[in-house]
Amino acid sequence: APPCLDGSPCANGGRCTQLPSREAACLCPPGWVGERCQLEDPCHSGPCAGRGVCQSSVVAGTARFSCRCPRGFRGPDCSLPDPCLSSPCAHGARCSVGPDGRFLCSCPPGYQGRSCRSDVDECRVGEPCRHGGTCLNTPGSFRCQCPAGYTGPLCENPAVPCAPSPCRNGGTCRQSGDLTYDCACLPGFEGQNCEVNVDDCPGHRCLNGGTCVDGVNTYNCQCPPEWTGQFCTEDVDECQLQPNACHNGGTCFNTLGGHSCVCVNGWTGESCSQNIDDCATAVCFHGATCHDRVASFYCACPMGKTGLLCHLDDACVSNPCHEDAICDTNPVNGRAICTCPPGFTGGACDQDVDECSIGANPCEHLGRCVNTQGSFLCQCGRGYTGPRCETDVNECLSGPCRNQATCLDRIGQFTCICMAGFTGTYCE
């Protein structure tokens, strides 16, 4: 029989559940722990102070608790302040709490004292340097100055001049005596340890204003813009460069060590980028404003003046043209030029054009032309309409035929084609 059915094994309201292994297990209500919920939960009373997290455990039939304390607190119930919180240990020493509740610092080598702030003078504790080396105390450590013939941190090794090699920049070390060496330097370097980069610029071949820049066993020439090549001996063809060396349509001509531009009208300067100020030589009359343009200028005239230089009186000021005509001034002589509206003619556009007498009759279909001021009218014959009698009047539009008769439009009249049994003009 399943174990949960043989009378519940769970005490204190624990709920019996069957595990996959067919064993019984108890799910305890708050306040109880243990296999059968038979023990009071020590965490239930909230024994951990502050924000301490309580964890209960059952060991040998007894319920116990432990507190996981937040930063800055310690003790079984997190009620004691943590002395390590203020980082009292210097120089990376490890901080722990002693039995008395105070901090303890585990000092790294070279430091001592309660907070590991005191430097240990290794030079006074015995003689760490061998073979007569001079001990020099340093913060947290010491250094040995070795006598000739010895090397190593404690002067413990007999010196080999080329191990490690003192030669720099790829130089090769050669031992020349017990304690001496020579460096065979790579090309471009010199000095006892090949530490000096030879200046290759004396006697350089940079021409045409090129500047020598030293390299390793070589040099480079920084050329002015008109020259190129390894030694600045190649002329730059500025006319091949993009963007064009000559602006605003100027023509480029390469020269040896430069170029020249032939500018189009209106432009000047080495690269044709300056617009010539044509107003500097312009003679706009007094009161006019000169505006520079490319290879030209424009005089903005004051009221009453006209002409290219504003040197003429504007004849249009006196309104010589008939109303609706457009007045312009001849820029050469200042006289008024009247542009007439339709229907008028004459120098001042004040003469009516008789449209009925010039050329063919403007009225179609024998309409009668009547001249009017600035225009004309057409009096149309019977059957025609429109401004020029151009439209045939459709007399059928008014639907004059009766009794489903068909209307035929004629010029100035209509005809009704009657259905059987009807007669009359309108088939009425």
Epitope: L207, N208, T228, G229, Q230, F231, T233, E234, D235, V236, D237, C239, Q240, F253, N254, T255, L256, G257, G258, S260
Partner: antibody, heavy 120, light 112 residues
Framework: EVQLLESGGGLVQPGGSLRLSCAAS????????MSWVRQAPGKGLEWVSY????????YYPDSVKGRFTISRDNSKNTLYLQMNSLRAEDTAVYYC?????????????WGQGTMVTVSS | DVVMTQTPLSLSVTPGQPASISCRSS???????????LHWYLQKPGQSPQLLIY???NRFSGVPDRFSGSGSGTDFTLKISRVEAEDVGVYFC?????????FGQGTKVEIK
Amino acid sequence: EVQLLESGGGLVQPGGSLRLSCAASGFAFSHYDMSWVRQAPGKGLEWVSYISRGGGSTYYPDSVKGRFTISRDNSKNTLYLQMNSLRAEDTAVYYCGRHATTAYWYFDVWGQGTMVTVSS
Amino acid sequence: DVVMTQTPLSLSVTPGQPASISCRSSQSLVHTQGNTYLHWYLQKPGQSPQLLIYKVSNRFSGVPDRFSGSGSGTDFTLKISRVEAEDVGVYFCSQSTHVPWTFGQGTKVEIK
């Protein structure tokens, strides 16, 4: 016919001066860059000076720099070479040459040459 | 300065036979902007030099097609496919890539 005609050569003492001329005809002289080239007796050719079409740009090799001056008068269609502080090694036939194009710097027209002899 | 070395210094050729002149420069004549400015001139006896070939291989106007130029970098060649009596004279190679512009020492061509 396109022609260059040099003149002004002659015998001059070391340290002396001479001015050579090159008269151009048959082409638009002001449109071309020009140079002087010399040829020592029985020797090769040596370029000695250059001037641009408008005269604004000149160039000399180290052998004559500071002693020779090239110039031109476009209104007279004439090229000049002023030679000062002449030395024995300046003895040569001096040719004026026209540059066909300022992109390639070769000489497409040469004069017939004028002889300069520097001797004491 | 760029030194131009011509070989041979003299050449005796049978009419109708080919001839070849070599020109070597002490530096590459390829300009940074791409072109190679190597030219050939002929100086006939008692005359001034005249242009034959410009920019390595371009025949100047009026130059017969028996003349041809080739090469690149530092090595260049002038070839005459069939030498004629009028081809006698001194041939000069010249470079205008680097200033100062320089000429070869010349190759004297004569007819056998």
